[in-house]
Interface confidence: medium
């Protein structure tokens, strides 16, 4: 794969996951209401990081806001911030990757420039989607506390819940918007993970200088530093295809080990 | 101007029965969650229960829970709540309320408009 | 459960300005009712700081922490009443105990 096609696909599939952590934040159905053993409700509840929602049966639907920062645990409102800084890091990544791409020529730009603005971007979307997998994880991991609780108290008689809104009778799961915020947060990783690979193959190579004639006793031989690294798989003609190989595995290993950042 | 007007009320044997209504205008009734909050002589405001606008949802505080049910007829802009097997705790002014909201939402935080109130005495 | 808990009585002379505390609600949704003797409630304040229509601006509210206070600036004898607080504990709604205030 080129360096133009790798580093266009990691800003497209930056931008699918950007889009995809700004859609999960706005989203309602963080958490809803566990249908399990009350499959036939009258009030179905959902609740997102900014309201909470009511759909009856009939279809009515009503949602409110949080109002103020009182009662709201501070769990909620460090995923808040998470996924704020997500898409405040996203944006910047866009800007920057946006002028960062080999295909969009701005002025004078050499490619040294353009280098550090792709791994720039990459990084940042790395850490935008690192930023909305954790957030979104810390959530998932108050439902599930809340659930279990809510769980036993089912069975001990004892009151509602705090966190979001837990009563006896209500137990709340997984929604759609964790989901998305994960897929999303992994698309952005991945994204992040490409343009990082591609900033390596727009890096001018400082030792493919001028060849050089060297005089040895006896004999009038020419050799180009670069000849011998071509021979070997190494050569400046073969850095990209080599690069994205491994960014292919990469992207593979990342798809399949969702939870593994060790390699970014 | 919105007016909630409550009937029903007056005296009851304990374990005995009463239906009281609330008749409501000067709003759309039908867009609104309707509530029945209770005050008992000399004492503050207890919220009794709550019905979404269609009427699909209610819920009731735990001290009326299972003795109580809230009903509306929004054809006829009519609100209901039958009390069963009263005590001498439920002797209260009992008012009609309107919520801002269309859904149940368990809450007393948004009730703007109140009727006049109705005195249940549960009394032998 | 959540309990809203208020001062049993604020005292202030007329002009001063009376602040009632509301704390141990849940969620960060309180309303401030008015009541008078022999009358119904009356919405001053929703959704914390929110007045309505026909309310005058004297009227104010405010939060900190968990505590979410109703203000009354420049208190007027006509002021003089019960006021609750109310909210909802996640499963019911809920009604601070009231505050008596007293204009001297």
């Known amino acids: 794969m080129s360096v133009t096609a790798c580093q266009g696909l990691g800003f497209v599939v930056s931008l699918i996951g950007f889009a995809g952590i700004i859609a999960a934040t706005c989203m309602d159905q963080w958490s809803t209401q566990d249908l399990y053993n009350n499959p036939v409700t009258a009030v179905f509840n959902y609740q997102g990081l900014w309201r909470s929602c009511v759909r009856e049966s009939s279809g009515f639907t009503e949602c409110r806001g949080y109002f103020t920062l009182l009662g709201l645990p501070a769990m909620l409102q460090a995923v808040r911030a998470l996924m704020i800084v997500g898409i405040v890091l996203g944006v910047i990544g866009i800007l920057v990757s946006i002028f960062a791409l080999k295909c969009i020529r701005i002025g004078s730009m050499d490619d040294s420039a353009k280098a550090k603005m792709t791994l720039t971007s990459g990084i940042l979307f790395i850490i935008s989607g690192i930023c909305a997998i954790i957030g979104v994880s810390v959530f998932a991991n108050m439902l599930v506390t809340n659930f279990w609780m809510s769980t036993a108290n089912m069975y001990s008689g004892m009151g509602g819940m705090g966190g979001m809104v837990q009563t006896v009778q209500t137990r709340y799961t997984f929604g759609a918007a964790l989901f998305v915020g994960w897929v999303a947060g992994g698309l952005t990783l991945i994204g992040g993970v490409m343009m990082c690979i591609a900033c390596r193959g727009l890096t001018p190579d400082d030792s493919n200088f001028k060849a050089v004639s060297y005089h040895a006793s006896g004999q009038n031989v020419a050799y180009r530093p670069g000849g011998f690294k071509a021979s070997t798989g190494f050569g400046s003609n073969t850095r990209n295809k080599k690069i994205y190989d491994g960014g292919a595995r990469t992207e593979d290993d990342e798809q399949s080990h969702p939870t593994k950042y060790d390699y970014v | 101007e919105v007016q909630l007007l409550e009937s029903g009320g007056g005296l009851v044997q304990p374990g005995g029965s009463l239906r009281l209504s609330c008749a409501a205008s000067?709003?759309?009734?039908?867009?609104?969650?309707m509530m029945w909050v209770r005050q008992a002589p000399g004492k503050g405001l207890e919220w009794v229960g709550e019905?979404?606008?269609?009427?699909?949802?209610?819920y009731y505080g735990s001290a009326v829970k299972g003795r109580a049910t809230i009903s509306r007829d929004n054809s006829k802009n009519t609100l209901y709540l039958q009390m069963n097997s009263l005590r001498a705790e439920d002797t209260a002014v009992y008012y009609c309320?309107?919520?801002?909201?269309?859904?149940?939402?368990?809450?007393?935080?948004?009730?703007?408009?109140w009727g006049q109130g109705t005195l249940v005495t549960v009394s032998s | 459960s959540y309990e809203l808990t208020q001062p049993p009585s604020v005292s202030v002379s007329p002009g001063q300005t009376a602040r009632i505390t509301c704390s141990g609600g849940?969620?960060?949704?309180y309303g401030w009712y008015q009541q008078k003797p022999g009358q119904a409630p009356v919405l001053v304040i929703y959704?914390?700081?929110q007045r309505p229509s026909g309310i005058p601006e004297r009227f104010s509210g405010s939060s900190s922490g968990t505590t979410v206070t109703l203000t009354i600036s420049g208190v007027q004898a006509e002021d003089e009443a019960d006021y609750y607080c109310?909210?909802?504990?996640?499963?019911?709604?809920?009604f601070g105990g009231g505050t008596k205030l007293t204009v001297l």
């Open positions: 019905i979404s606008s269609t009427g699909g949802s209610t």
């Open positions: 959704s914390n700081n």
């Open positions: 849940y969620n960060g949704h």
């Open positions: 109310g909210g909802y504990d996640s499963s019911a709604g809920i």
């Open positions: 000067g709003f759309t009734f039908r867009s609104y969650a």
């Open positions: 309320a309107k919520s801002t909201y269309g859904a149940t939402w368990k809450s007393a935080d948004s009730i703007d408009a």
